[in-house]
């Protein structure tokens, strides 16, 4: 089962009130980065899996979830530095012994190959050009998701140009 | 400028002890992975001791387990390796080193020291 | 502990030689190796990592192959400053991070 994504879009015409008011537009807040219907933001900071867990948390986010292997690949695309591993929202269920995302969902075979042990306590990273698991106590950067959000600007019809 | 510089080594009688230091300047110290690395002269390299960014994690090769304690202060950018019971065979240049940061425990080492000498001998 | 066994323990080469470093394993290490250049007197250099990933500086002569127990360092073509002591180290994630015993390449 894959982590479910909620999708949002905007018909501009229909969000089109006043000449003088811009359309509805989908955003991301500032210093995000938008990937397809997702803000994505990366850690300049490190920490265990579950302070970073925790620190999505009060930006109103989560850990990353990857829906796809094309998600994977367009999100290890923005990781421009080799050295680099980013924490996602993925860990190891003793109790259920299986990948476990953090909306509840499980792993499925197909999406995300994944480097190292499955056993307790292990968490999952990705680099640009890999998914690995690791102790979860390991300090490593994260990156935190949230949907786009809807912002109404006011502003002069001459500024859509 | 990215360097690590060691100081503290010296001659020392076996069963005593040192405080070796490690100055970090030019990145920010406090989110990598530090390790201790030394070599005996002429041999090779001997992993010793790795501490997390934050310190909450610390790991030594058995050789060196209840002897030696590592220790990080973030606020100084400074590295700290206490030596205690030193016998001959820690006899080496102990290097100050930086992990990669990607790569959780797996420690590759992309910075290191020029190295202190530490000569146990009676 | 994971040994680390490196051949030759040295060889004697010419500039614009090709020069092959071979590292065994004790067990699989999957890709979590590196390799080091140390000159005499001074600290060792990071080349490779993750078996075959070239650190950022590093000239591209140098390469690193291989995965499991057996890897390789290629010096494509060797120049005057590459005459050194080579160590390869495994980095899995279970301390003590081994280091092989060098190769010392020097000048035919």
């Known amino acids: 089962q894959k982590p479910s994504i909620g999708k949002c879009s905007v018909d501009i015409q229909q969000n089109r009130t006043k000449t003088t008011e811009r359309p509805d537009l989908l955003n991301c807040p500032i210093y995000w980065q938008q990937v397809q219907e997702k803000c994505l933001l990366f850690s300049h900071t490190v920490n265990p899996w579950n302070n970073s867990l925790a620190d999505c948390s009060t930006k109103e986010s989560s850990l990353l979830l990857i829906q796809d292997k094309d998600e994977l690949t367009r999100t290890q695309n923005l990781i421009h530095d080799k050295a680099i591993s980013f924490w996602i929202g993925l860990n190891f269920s003793l109790s259920e012994k299986n990948w476990k995302w953090i909306n509840g969902s499980f792993l499925s075979s197909n999406d995300l190959k994944i480097t190292g042990d499955a056993k307790e306590n292990s968490c999952v990273y990705i680099s640009q050009t890999s998914v690995y698991s690791e102790y979860c106590s390991t300090e490593m950067k994260w990156i935190c998701q949230k949907e786009l959000t809807l912002v109404r600007n006011k502003v002069s019809p001459d500024s859509w140009l | 400028q990215v360097q690590l510089v060691e100081s503290g080594g010296g001659l020392v009688k076996p069963g005593g002890s040192l405080r070796l230091s490690c100055a970090a300047s030019?990145?920010?110290?406090?989110?990598?992975?530090m390790s201790w690395i030394r070599q005996a002269p002429g041999k090779g390299l001997e992993w010793v001791s790795y501490?997390?960014?934050?310190?909450?994690?610390?790991a030594y090769a058995d050789s060196v387990k209840g002897r030696f304690t590592i220790s990080r202060d973030n606020a100084k950018n400074s590295l700290y390796l206490q030596m205690n019971s030193l016998r001959a065979e820690d006899t080496a240049v102990y290097y100050c080193?930086?992990?990669?940061?990607?790569?959780?425990?797996?420690?590759?080492?992309?910075?290191w020291g020029r190295g202190t000498l530490v000569t146990v001998s009676s | 502990d994971i040994q680390l066994t490196q051949s030759p323990s040295s060889v004697s080469a010419s500039v614009g030689d090709r020069v092959t470093i071979t590292c065994r394993a004790s067990?699989?290490?999957?890709?979590?190796l590196a390799w080091y250049q140390q000159k005499p007197g001074k600290a060792p250099k990071l080349l490779i990592y993750?078996?075959?990933s070239l650190q950022s500086g590093v000239p591209s002569r140098f390469s690193g192959s291989g995965s499991g127990t057996d890897f390789t360092l290629t010096i494509s073509s060797l120049q005057p400053e590459d005459f050194a002591t080579y160590y390869c180290?495994?980095?899995?994630?279970?301390?003590?991070?081994?280091f092989g015993g060098g190769t010392k390449v020097e000048i035919k």
């Open positions: 080193a930086r992990s990669l940061m990607a790569t959780g425990t797996h420690l590759y080492f992309d910075l």
């Open positions: 030019g990145f920010t110290f406090a989110q990598y992975y």
């Open positions: 501490i997390s960014p934050s310190g909450s994690t610390i």
């Open positions: 067990q699989d290490i999957s890709s979590w």
């Open positions: 993750a078996a075959s």
């Open positions: 180290q495994q980095v899995t994630s279970f301390p003590p991070y081994t």
